[in-house]
């Protein structure tokens, strides 16, 4: 597994990471840490493992956290109720 750096699919990344689109270069995907408590997220980000190529810049939240709405268009990783 690729621990950091360029990737194509989740399977190339280490545990606790996903293969998300780079925030600097949209044509590149990089192994990115899953969302921690308080991190921004999107509720429809594909769960890990995803077998296709992601479009989002962020990974889903870590296990035990959920991507919850805090205001109209803002979602963050929070502890599951």
């Amino acid at each position: 597994a690729v621990i950091t750096g360029a990737c194509d699919k989740d399977s190339q990344c280490g545990g606790g990471m996903c293969c998300a689109v780079s925030i600097w270069v949209k044509s590149i995907r990089i192994c990115t840490p899953m969302g921690k408590l308080g991190d921004s997220c999107h509720p429809l980000t594909r769960k890990v493992p995803f077998f296709g190529r992601r479009m989002h810049h962020t990974c889903p939240c870590l296990p035990g956290l959920a991507c919850l709405r805090t205001s109209f268009n803002r979602f963050i990783c929070l502890a599951q109720k």
């Epitope: 429809l44 594909r46 769960k47 077998f51 190529r53 479009m55 989002h56």
Partner: antibody
Framework: EVQLVQSGAEVKKPGASVKVSCKAS????????MHWVRQAPGQGLEWIGY????????TYNQKFKGRVTITVDKSTSTAYLELSSLRSEDTAVYYC??????????????WGQGTLVTVSS | DIVMTQSPDSLAVSLGERATINCKAS??????????MNWYQQKPGQPPKLLIY???NLESGVPDRFSGSGSGTDFTLTISSLQAEDVAVYYC?????????FGQGTKVEIK
């Protein structure tokens, strides 16, 4: 060749339940999610929900929450839709549709032939 | 829920002419610079067929006379040169927010 073959038409009474099956072939079943969509006679399309065929995790349209259950049997590469407490307005063609794995675009690239469910007393 | 409104409800176009279908979302379906909008074609008695995903990406095997454009709340499906086999109902679908919702459909006929 990717194929989704659904079970046959059903006639049910109000208050009953129905379970529709969708057998997949021609691809790695657990690598793709499966959606369910319905279409009332002469009407448009309505998304019911989807399931990860890998983990079994589901996401449902809140409109159907509590009445719908989507499951998979990995050993037979089959997805199931169960809808309970049927009413006349549930009369529709029910489609399973494979997610195309186009990232978060959730596009449905292969569809079953549809199963007509008629709810009538 | 995001409401998708297509216009017109139906249109008749001569063979070889351009057909344009519009779809308006009740709120933006963009995220991180991408537009989460799909287009489907449905012929009578058949299931829908995916034409365009993520607003402008042509599905494999779909003729290149079909194209999608737009961002935010306003999207367009264009058939550059209408063929007889394009007679169908066309649906837009947003996939940026659960529940995924479809437009009411636009029926395309030959004039």
């Amino acid at each position: 060749e990717v194929q989704l073959v659904q079970s046959g038409a059903e006639v049910k009474k109000p208050g009953a339940s129905v379970k529709v099956s969708c057998k997949a072939s021609g691809y790695s079943f657990t690598d793709y999610d499966m959606h369910w969509v319905r279409q009332a006679p002469g009407q448009g399309l309505e998304w019911i929900g989807y399931i990860s065929c890998y983990s079994g995790a589901t996401t449902y349209n809140q409109k159907f929450k509590g009445r719908v259950t989507i499951t998979v049997d990995k050993s037979t590469s089959t997805a199931y839709l169960e809808l309970s407490s049927l009413r006349s307005e549930d009369t529709a063609v029910y489609y399973c549709a494979r997610d195309g794995n186009y990232g978060e675009a959730y596009a449905m690239d292969y569809w079953g032939q549809g199963t007509l469910v008629t709810v009538s007393s | 829920d995001i409401v998708m409104t297509q216009s017109p409800d139906s249109l008749a176009v001569s063979l070889g002419e351009r057909a344009t279908i519009n779809c308006k979302a009740s709120q933006s379906v963009d995220y991180d610079g991408d537009s989460y909008m799909n287009w489907y074609q449905q012929k009578p008695g058949q299931p829908p067929k995916l034409l365009i995903y993520a607003a402008s990406n042509l599905e494999s095997g779909v003729p290149d006379r079909f194209s999608g454009s737009g961002s935010g709340t306003d999207f367009t499906l264009t058939i550059s040169s209408l063929q007889a086999e394009d007679v169908a109902v066309y649906y837009c679908q947003q996939i940026n927010e659960d529940p995924f919702t479809f437009g009411q459909g636009t029926k395309v006929e030959i004039k």
